[in-house]
């Protein structure tokens, strides 16, 4: 039996959308089905439909198809939002360009190349012909639209309304001519849906014929719509998986735009003396790696073969043998001239954040009036007046508009961590600016650290070395996995957000990570019923020097008997000395035969001054740190526990008061542990949760 082809790739999907007919004369056909693929196959073949199907809606709730002889561009129809609906429109009817000879073109152009109006196909005036709609079923010889029913050279044509000119081709451009990209097409969001050899692209939301990791819900910023060519991974140009089972992927033929300039939002800040963010905009002339080994020329294939050539990466300034960051690595790098060392980072190039000199702020920077208008990650700030609505959403007073001029970094909401700005990038709505506190400025942003002024509990309600196994309600405990391995702990503080440590991310590629929730065993053994495995969609790094990361989940966790959130403390609160707290983790235990179960170690809070004494004065703690000593000699957090919580209870309420970060050794007797003080960063956490978009469940 011949395998029926999957035709859903021929449709443009608009999620959460349906079509409503205003014109009652328009027909609709409905039927119960299981999948959108079934709807698509029937629409393409027009099987059992009393009309030519141009679009359909799949009702996910009722498992129902609604087939239409119209689409969103038709008259007598309007689009409407609906959670349970997905609209699929046949691309042939909405495309305004042709592929190959244009045999599949079903657009509405009805004028020839020289500007003559086309004759309707059903008419024999002024020209008699045999191209009747009834003789060419499926070729859509509707109205007087240009068509190419026989697939002839020259593309779509029509009989003309001029008695002197029998027929003429229409001037419909090739899709490959219409589509263009800048640089290597990382920001390309066009509608090219076939490869350079003409193979149809596989939908990004499908796993057949090729399984892949580029799921649209996992990478909402990559533009994985339908089956359009994209460049999500720094390739030389856009590509796609193909419907040919024997060809996994292929590049697409998209030409470079004549005006090859990047959108303002895509341009990294160009620097020549220092690195801004990850140094993607570094254009200096350093040409050795960190240890002095010279760089290989980018246009050379010796001693290392590679495809990072100036031709492949047109906008990345791969001149000579200068250090560059064309692929989103963590900093500029190069291939080296040493045959034994393929690549090296140029980490000797200073960070621009360190070289602002004059530009600094006092206190928390609420009076900063400098002219910097760039975030720490190199994004250009957007104008304050465009963002006032968002600002009002998270502050409860009228900001001083006189300070919010242009797009300069400011601190209108009294943020403890300094000036910031909105970015215009929907993925990173706002970020801090690379400005340091002025040297010698000791203004505290929180006072009286060792005296309980503010209670940490909001309301009065109800790995670990030498730790003991635990199975109490620890549903907020997250195991962060990196390439199939537990790497760190984390705390679920909101359905879509995990609080963890920045040291937990050795790779920038988010598809290498997963969050496991609801487990007790590090390998998930025996936790099958309660385990939730969620992908990671974004990392939001904490304020400079915080070591914190808020990790956004690709979809919200489902809260149940095994998965729950843990509360955050009040901003700037202090917890009394000697308060009993606990650290949790699946890290190093010191046991020869570790059973893999989550362990807990009990600690007690120690004031910062006393803590410093225990560290023999070698450590001075600041307002962003919290200290806790072990109740049992030689127990405490270690490798594999990083990112996990220090949990304390106040007024019968458990809160995450600290985050475990790499310190000065594990569980050293009489040497208390130093944690990131969550209360110091509580406002930042709330601000991120409030301002960053999360997927709906």
């Amino acid at each position: 039996q011949r395998k029926r082809r999957n035709t859903i790739h021929e449709f443009k999907k608009s999620a959460k959308t349906t079509l409503i007919k205003i014109d009652p004369a328009l027909k609709i056909k409905t039927k119960k089905v299981n999948t959108a693929d079934q709807c698509a196959n029937r629409c393409t073949r027009n099987k059992g439909l009393p009309f030519t199907c141009k679009a359909f809606v799949f009702d996910k709730a009722r498992k129902q198809c609604l087939w239409f002889p119209f689409n969103s561009m038709s008259s007598g129809v309007k689009k409407e939002f609906g959670h349970e609906f997905d609209l699929y429109e046949n691309k042939d009817y909405i495309r305004n360009c042709i592929i190959g000879k244009g045999r599949s073109y079903k657009g509405t152009v009805s004028i020839t190349k020289s500007g003559i109006k086309c004759q309707p196909w059903s008419s024999m005036i002024p020209h008699e012909h045999s191209f009747l709609p009834s003789s060419y079923r499926g070729k859509d010889l509707q109205e007087n639209y240009c068509r190419n029913p026989r697939g002839e050279e020259g593309g779509p044509w029509c009989f003309t309304s001029n008695p002197e000119v029998r027929y003429e081709v229409c001037d419909i451009p090739q899709c490959s001519e219409v589509e263009c990209m800048t640089c290597n097409g990382e920001s390309y969001r066009g509608l090219m849906d076939h490869t350079e050899s003409g193979k149809i692209c596989q939908r990004w939301d499908h796993q057949t014929p090729h399984r892949h990791k580029f799921l649209p819900e996992r990478y909402p910023d990559k533009g994985f719509d339908d089956n359009y060519c994209r460049n999500p991974d720094g390739q030389p140009r856009p590509w796609c998986y193909t419907l040919d089972p024997h060809t996994r992927w292929e590049y697409c033929a998209i030409k470079t735009c004549a005006d090859n300039t990047m959108n303002d939002t895509d341009v990294p800040l160009e620097t020549t003396e220092c690195i801004q963010g990850q140094g993607e905009g570094y254009r200096g002339t350093v040409n050795t790696i960190w240890n002095g080994i010279p760089c290989q020329r980018w246009d050379s294939q010796y001693p290392h073969e590679h495809d990072m050539t100036p031709e492949n990466f047109k906008c990345k300034d791969l001149r000579e043998n200068y250090c560059r960051n064309p692929d989103g690595s963590e900093s500029p790098w190069c291939f080296t001239t040493d045959p034994n060392i393929r690549v090296g980072y140029c980490s000797q190039i200073p960070n621009c954040d360190m070289s602002h000199g004059q530009d600094c702020y006092r206190g928390n920077g609420k009076n900063y009036m400098g002219n910097l208008s760039q975030t720490r990650s190199g994004l250009t700030c957007s104008m304050w007046d465009k963002n006032m609505e968002d600002l009002h959403r998270h502050i409860f007073w009228e900001p001083d508009a006189s300070k919010l001029n242009e797009n300069y970094c400011r601190n209108p909401d009294d943020d403890a961590h300094g000036p910031w700005c909105y970015t215009g990038n929907p993925l990173i709505p706002w970020d801090y600016c690379p400005i340091s506190r002025c040297e010698g400025d000791t203004t505290p942003t929180i006072v009286n650290l060792d005296h309980p002024v503010i209670s940490c509990a909001k309301t009065k309600q109800l790995r670990v070395v030498n730790g003991i196994p635990t199975r109490t309600n620890i549903g907020w405990m997250v195991s962060l996995r990196y390439r199939n391995k537990h790497i760190c702990g984390g705390s679920l503080i909101k359905e879509s957000w995990v609080l963890t440590a920045r040291q937990c991310f050795p790779s920038r590629d988010l598809k290498d990570y997963e969050a496991w929730l609801g487990i007790h065993d590090v390998h998930g053994r025996g936790d099958e019923k309660c385990k939730q495995v969620l992908n990671v969609s974004q990392l939001v790094y904490g304020p400079e020097g915080s070591d914190l990361v808020l990790m956004k989940l690709a979809r919200p966790a489902v809260l149940d008997d095994f998965v729950s959130t843990i509360d955050l403390p009040n901003y700037g609160c202090t917890i009394p000395e000697k308060t009993s707290c606990s650290v949790y983790g699946w890290g190093y235990t010191g046991l020869i035969n570790y059973d893999g179960l989550l362990r807990v170690a009990h600690l007690y809070i120690m004031g910062n001054e006393k803590c410093s004494q225990h560290h023999r004065g070698k450590v001075t703690l600041n307002e962003s740190e919290i200290c806790a000593g072990a109740e049992k000699i030689g127990s405490g957090p270690c490798e594999g526990d990083y990112g996990g919580p220090l949990v304390c209870e106040q007024h019968k309420m458990r809160m995450v008061l600290g985050v475990i970060v790499p310190g000065r050794g594990c569980a050293i007797p009489n040497r208390p542990g130093i944690f990131v003080r969550v209360a110091y960063y509580a406002k930042w956490i709330h601000k991120i949760i409030l301002t960053y978009k999360v997927p709906q469940s």
Epitope: E330, Y345, S347, R463, Y482, R483, N484, K485, H486, I487, Q503, P506, S507, V522, H523, R525, W586, G587, Y588, I592, N593, Y594, D595, G596, C638, E639, G640, P662, R664, G665, C666
Partner: antibody
Framework: QVQLQQSGADLMKPGASVKISCKAT????????IEWVKQRPGHGLEWIGE????????NYNEKFKGKATFTADTSSNTAYMQLSSLTSEDSAVYYC?????????????WGQGTTLTVSS | NIVMTQSPKSMSMSVGERVTLTCKAS??????VSWYQQKPEQSPKLLIY???NRYTGVPDRFTGSGSATDFTLTISSVQAEDLADYHC?????????FGGGTKLEIK
Amino acid sequence: QVQLQQSGADLMKPGASVKISCKATGYTFSGNWIEWVKQRPGHGLEWIGEILPGSGNTNYNEKFKGKATFTADTSSNTAYMQLSSLTSEDSAVYYCARGGHYYGSSWDYWGQGTTLTVSS
Amino acid sequence: NIVMTQSPKSMSMSVGERVTLTCKASENVVTYVSWYQQKPEQSPKLLIYGASNRYTGVPDRFTGSGSATDFTLTISSVQAEDLADYHCGQGYSYPYTFGGGTKLEIK
């Protein structure tokens, strides 16, 4: 106590394949990653890859993909590394070591090593 | 790949002397560094994990320190039985990598 016992020395011809074994005793075999390491005189230690016996999950050093294949048999507490298409470059001492249950862990127990000589 | 550069390549010390071996990473590896001792004709043995934690049973004359890119193994008073190769390795970024080793000889 924990022990990793490796198979004995092998002399192989170029182009052949060899399977080195590593039998673990004294701990729960399924829960710790087994690491494989190559050592050639003057080349230091080189990580080949790892396997978690309980799940069969593996991670390979790109350099050894296609050269090394890891398997594990939890019924006999034995991990295996197969090396294919042998050349003189594969002549070395190969170690298995016990990794931790988490990423980034140190390797606390090592096998005695298996010397592989590839020669025609 | 992260390159671990060990220095010196070899050193000759007298019993009782203080020895300092260094290991430099080409990128930040946090504290995911281990030190291994390999005596002649033997397999490596773990000395230090997590950059500064002494493994069970390791004499307290061995001390590890450092973070990010610079790491040190110190033997406070070298003994005859410390004759060995010392390897540092990073476990922070795939592929795991080792330094070239330092050969410690006893005069």
